[in-house]
């Protein structure tokens, strides 16, 4: 799943995985 | 706030190992997808590879250039990113950067293959 | 492997003016999900990139709004409404839709 960028209650930072494709399957050769 | 500190570069023959390590700080390291991202002087960037968190079985990707050869990992206990590499090329020469799925960037880490 | 064409390889740009850079895949970056990956970064001169934008058109965290992305499917473009002088360095558009993750080769921008 991804996650978005945010604060917690603990201070920490949530990194933001909302770049990249969740189930990534290789490029097709063209 | 957010650091990513990358240690374990420094010079290696041709064929030999380092490992790197990632350590993350101020960020919820386990829901992190992590990679690392290398550049040769003056070059532009390559992805080398990710490994994904718990809930995405950590699953790992390579690039086709060091598959077989480089092994990325994480120890969410240490907050930390690993990437084993093995059978070094000349061509591996560069400054390695690990980084929250592109999210959050540390400042890297040069590594040099030379004889 | 995705081939990522950026251009102009070099901008040179008057403080307070736009700035406009394109970027073109050469396959769709369309996932499944209907969400486009692609993410704009910036390396300023002596340090490590920083992302701006993702998916296309989100900035962000603590981005100023003078950038802005756009497009679809496999042409984008990355726009600064006015450059300021920290705005320097190389523009790098990368794809996150197949692996493997590929990167633009940079488009440097410099102060007139």
């Known amino acids: 799943s991804e996650t978005t960028t945010g604060t917690s209650s603990n201070s920490s930072q949530s990194t933001s995985n909302s770049g990249l494709a969740p189930n990534p399957t290789n490029a097709t050769t063209k | 706030e957010v650091q990513f500190v990358e240690s374990g570069g420094g010079l290696v023959q041709p064929g030999g190992s380092l490992k790197l390590s990632c350590a993350a700080s101020?960020?919820?390291?386990?829901?992190?997808?992590m990679d690392w991202v290398r550049q040769a002087s003056g070059k532009g960037l390559e992805w080398v590879a990710e490994?994904?968190?718990?809930?995405?079985?950590?699953?790992?990707y390579y690039a086709e250039s060091v598959k077989g050869r480089f092994t990325i990992s994480r120890d969410d206990s240490k907050s930390t990113a690993y990437l084993q590499m093995n059978s070094l090329k000349t061509e591996d020469t560069a400054i390695y950067y690990c980084?929250?799925?592109?999210?959050?960037w540390g400042q890297g880490t040069l590594v040099t293959v030379s004889s | 492997d995705i081939v990522m064409t950026q251009t102009p390889l070099s901008l040179s740009v008057t403080i307070g003016q736009p700035a406009s850079i394109s970027c073109k895949s050469s396959?769709?970056?369309?996932?499944?999900?209907?969400?486009?990956?692609l993410n704009w970064l910036l390396q300023k001169p002596g340090q490590s990139p920083k992302r701006l934008i993702y998916?296309?058109?989100k900035l962000d965290p603590g981005i100023p709004d003078r950038f802005s992305g756009s497009g679809s499917e496999t042409d984008f473009t990355l726009k600064i409404s006015r450059v300021e002088a920290e705005d320097v360095g190389i523009y790098y558009c990368?794809?996150?839709?197949?692996?493997?993750?590929?990167f633009g080769g940079g488009t440097k921008v410099e102060i007139k």
């Open positions: 101020g960020v919820t390291f386990s829901e992190a997808w």
């Open positions: 990368m794809q996150g839709s197949s692996l493997p993750w590929t």
């Open positions: 980084t929250g799925a592109m999210d959050y």
């Open positions: 490994i994904r968190d718990k809930p995405n079985s950590y699953v790992t």
């Open positions: 396959q769709s970056l369309l996932y499944s999900n209907g969400k486009t990956y």
């Open positions: 998916q296309v058109s």
